[in-house]
Amino acid sequence: KAMHVAQPAVVLASSRGIASFVCEYASPGKATEVRVTVLRQADSQVTEVCAATYMMGNELTFLDDSICTGTSSGNQVNLTIQGLRAMDTGLYICKVELMYPPPYYLGIGNGTQIYVIDPEPCPDSD
């Protein structure tokens, strides 16, 4: 009854520092409240990038100051992370928790390696 979470292995951020990927979970139960968290793993350190709790059938809402946005459809969440720079290149893990009703389930994806390349500055034109 473990919950499986799938996400793409690799994503390349756009030149504007935006990366999008789909996080899909196989729900073992009929959850009405789901929490989705994006974690970044660098070396052995794990940090939270953003998190949102949503009711099934409703929209996914991150905090106003979050660098993440997203939409949900059934057991699929479309995540977008913005404001990324080359130093943010790393492994981004999708974590899904079925919060309500009981029982609680935890699902952790294998991670999406996001590559971010800072755009070259435009040359001065004489």
């Epitope: 009854k1 473990a2 919950m3 499986h4 073992p28 409240e33 929490r35 968290t37 974690l39 794990v46 940090t47 939270e48 998190a51 709790t53 974590k95 919060m99 309500y100 009981p102 029982p103 609680y104 389930y105 935890l106 952790i108």
Partner: antibody
């Protein structure tokens, strides 16, 4: 540094109540699920209760459901366990533990002993 | 509820020897949600391994975890004097969170 410190344990008579506290420091308290785990003398570990993030969701072991209430005060960075209708079998060392971002219990307090005896 | 059964109950070994501890689950547990803890007398448990095989911060590399499905193993490659303690496995993939009954590693 990251730390959890429990308090509030003691000797109490069966049927009475007790409130345990767990003061957290060194991390963003509201980003983590917080658990209570107990250990009867000479026995193994038993999970008791968890409270999530903003406190909206809580889960309990069947053995304490309806008698214990877990809560948290984010402004005080403190976790609580209100224990009512205590029984002799609730005698144990009570630990608070942080559920890390990947789910394991990575930080534990030193424990507070609760003895239920007449 | 997922029941975890640890074996053996007690392991009597000498420093320098290899310790192999087993944890068997009553139903399949994803390796992402299996942890091992060490507990010494009078102390709180300490996280050793999470995700079945990842060492927690500061844990020496003589500790390793492996396994999948229903069978998991904690191995201590060469026992140091400070490793004699009780070890617990735990699953945290679904509620209720459950622990094994523990394996005591004692000095022979």
């Amino acid at each position: 540094q990251v730390q959890l410190v429990e308090s509030g344990g003691g000797v109490v008579q069966p049927g009475r109540s007790l409130r345990l506290s767990c003061a957290a420091s060194g991390f963003t308290f509201s980003s983590y699920g917080m658990h209570w785990v107990r250990q009867a003398p000479g026995k193994g570990l038993e999970w008791v209760a968890v409270i999530w993030y903003d406190g909206s969701n809580r889960y309990y072991a069947d053995s304490v459901k309806g008698r214990f209430t877990i809560s948290r005060d984010i402004s005080k960075n403190t976790l609580y366990l209100q224990m009512n209708s205590l029984r002799a079998e609730d005698t144990a060392m009570y630990y608070c533990a942080r559920g890390d971002l990947l789910g394991a219990f990575d930080i534990w307090g030193q424990g507070t002993m609760v003895t239920v005896s007449s | 509820e997922i029941v975890l059964t640890q074996s053996p109950g007690t392991l009597s070994l000498s420093p320098g020897e290899r310790a192999t501890l087993s944890c068997r689950a009553s139903q399949s547990v994803s390796s992402s949600y299996l942890a091992w803890y060490q507990q010494k007398p009078g102390q709180a448990p300490r996280l050793l391994i999470y995700g079945a095989s990842s060492r927690a911060t500061g844990i020496p590399d003589r500790f390793s975890g492996s396994g999948s499905g229903t069978d998991f193993t904690l191995t201590i490659s060469r026992l140091e004097p400070e490793d004699f303690a009780v070890y617990y496995c735990q699953q945290y993939g679904s509620s209720p969170w459950t622990f094994g009954q523990g394996t005591k590693v004692e000095i022979k």
